[in-house]
């Protein structure tokens, strides 16, 4: 068998809402993956599990099942959405995200994704993780790759 390549492309959009009573931020983050099947037979993308971390705390998880079948030597782009909540001990972020003196409220999130593929009864898992900028102050649609946070050695806390 040849490889199945998974490439995390980046954040496609982030839609924000607030609960003023709870001082809580809700971010629906849609991410894009490219999955390439380098084999001469079809493979099934069985599931995608994703989680988002802010400051080493998991703020959102998602799982998609029975997603698609990728034909031989084919590539498919898959979008998946992770609902995230910044609350409780991180409610200090509500101050930052709702401060109107700032126009771009970028926070650094760690996106983790695991893709499970199957072919001929064999299962394979491929994982990726990437730091991304997301604006927690307004709804944003990104050009693919625009939200990448390059300084992975020093993520903002």
């Amino acid at each position: 068998p040849r490889s199945i390549d998974v490439k995390y492309i980046g954040v496609k959009s982030a839609y924000v809402s607030y609960d003023v009573q709870k001082r809580t931020i809700y971010l629906n983050i849609t991410n894009t993956l490219n999955i390439t099947n380098n084999n001469y037979y079809s493979v099934e993308v069985e599931n995608i599990t994703a989680q988002v971390q802010f400051s080493k705390t998991v703020i959102g998880k998602a799982r998609l099942n029975n997603i698609t079948i990728i034909g031989p030597l084919d590539m498919k782009q898959i979008d998946y959405t992770v609902p995230t909540v910044i609350a409780e001990e991180m409610s200090y972020m509500y101050d930052f995200c709702t401060l109107i003196s700032i126009k771009v409220h970028n926070i650094v999130l760690m996106m983790q994704v695991t893709v499970t593929t199957t072919y001929f009864g064999h299962s394979e898992q491929i994982s990726q993780e990437r730091y991304q900028y997301v604006d927690c102050g307004r709804n944003t649609t990104y050009q693919l790759g625009q939200s990448e946070y390059l300084n992975v050695l020093q993520p903002q806390q």
Partner: antibody
């Protein structure tokens, strides 16, 4: 109904101090940033200070930086503006206003409290 | 600081006709995020300022649709399609691209 009621305005001498208050009601005070704006005798509006919803961040223009301090008490639903080293040019009607994080505007204003700095 | 410039008085208008009020900023208020941080406030006699327009062209809650606003990055116009007696007051443009600054205000005059 959103209500903002300022108080504490007075006649003070140059170099003196004064603390203004703004009592908020009709909305979840702890969920919104707040601002102070003043209107000079010639009717010009000048932004004075902004504080974030939890009081973590404050922002001031150079004209009042180091002399004015904005704070808030989210239990009492009250906003404060501590003014010191007052000058004659600080004479104005002082308004408090709510910052709206969707419109990025100051969407509700109080009726104001008058501060006069004069010898 | 960004300077906002307005004429002190509008051209006198007749009730029921349209009025335009202009404002100019010393720097473009269009942010790279696509939002123009230009606002209009109306101060009626004896009252505090009230929000009319946010982000250049959006009508604030409760504001009649007789009001509209348009502009480029630096030149802006507030239009009132059918002026009513209750529209009398001073109209301020403001920006918060870089902290808040206000124009000097334009007094709407009725013939």
């Amino acid at each position: 109904e959103v209500q903002l009621v300022e108080s504490g305005g007075d006649l003070v001498k140059p170099g003196g101090s004064l603390r203004l208050s703004c009592a908020a009601s009709g909305f979840t005070f702890s969920g919104y940033g707040m601002s102070w704006i003043r209107q000079t005798p010639d009717k010009r509006l000048e932004w004075v200070a902004t504080i974030s919803s939890g009081g973590r961040y404050t922002v001031y223009p150079d004209s009042v930086k180091g002399r004015f301090t904005m704070s808030r008490d989210n239990v009492k639903n009250t906003l404060y503006l501590q003014m010191s080293s007052l000058k004659s040019e600080d004479t104005a009607l002082y308004y408090c206003a709510r910052d709206n994080f969707y419109s990025y505007a100051m969407d509700y204003w109080g009726l104001g409290t008058s501060v006069t700095v004069s010898a | 600081d960004i300077v906002m410039t307005q004429a002190a008085f509008s051209n006198p208008v007749t009730l029921g006709t349209s009025a335009s009020i202009s404002c100019r900023s010393s720097k473009s208020l269009l942010h790279s995020n696509g939002i123009t941080y230009l606002f209009w406030y109306l101060q009626k006699p004896g009252q505090s300022p009230q929000l009319l327009i946010y982000q250049m062209s959006n009508l604030a809650s409760g504001v009649p649709d007789r009001f509209s606003s348009s502009g480029s990055g630096t030149d802006f116009t507030l239009r009132i399609s059918r002026v009513e007696a209750e529209d009398v007051g001073v109209y301020y443009c403001a920006q918060n691209l870089e902290l808040w600054t206000f124009g000097g205000g334009t007094k709407l005059e009725i013939k």
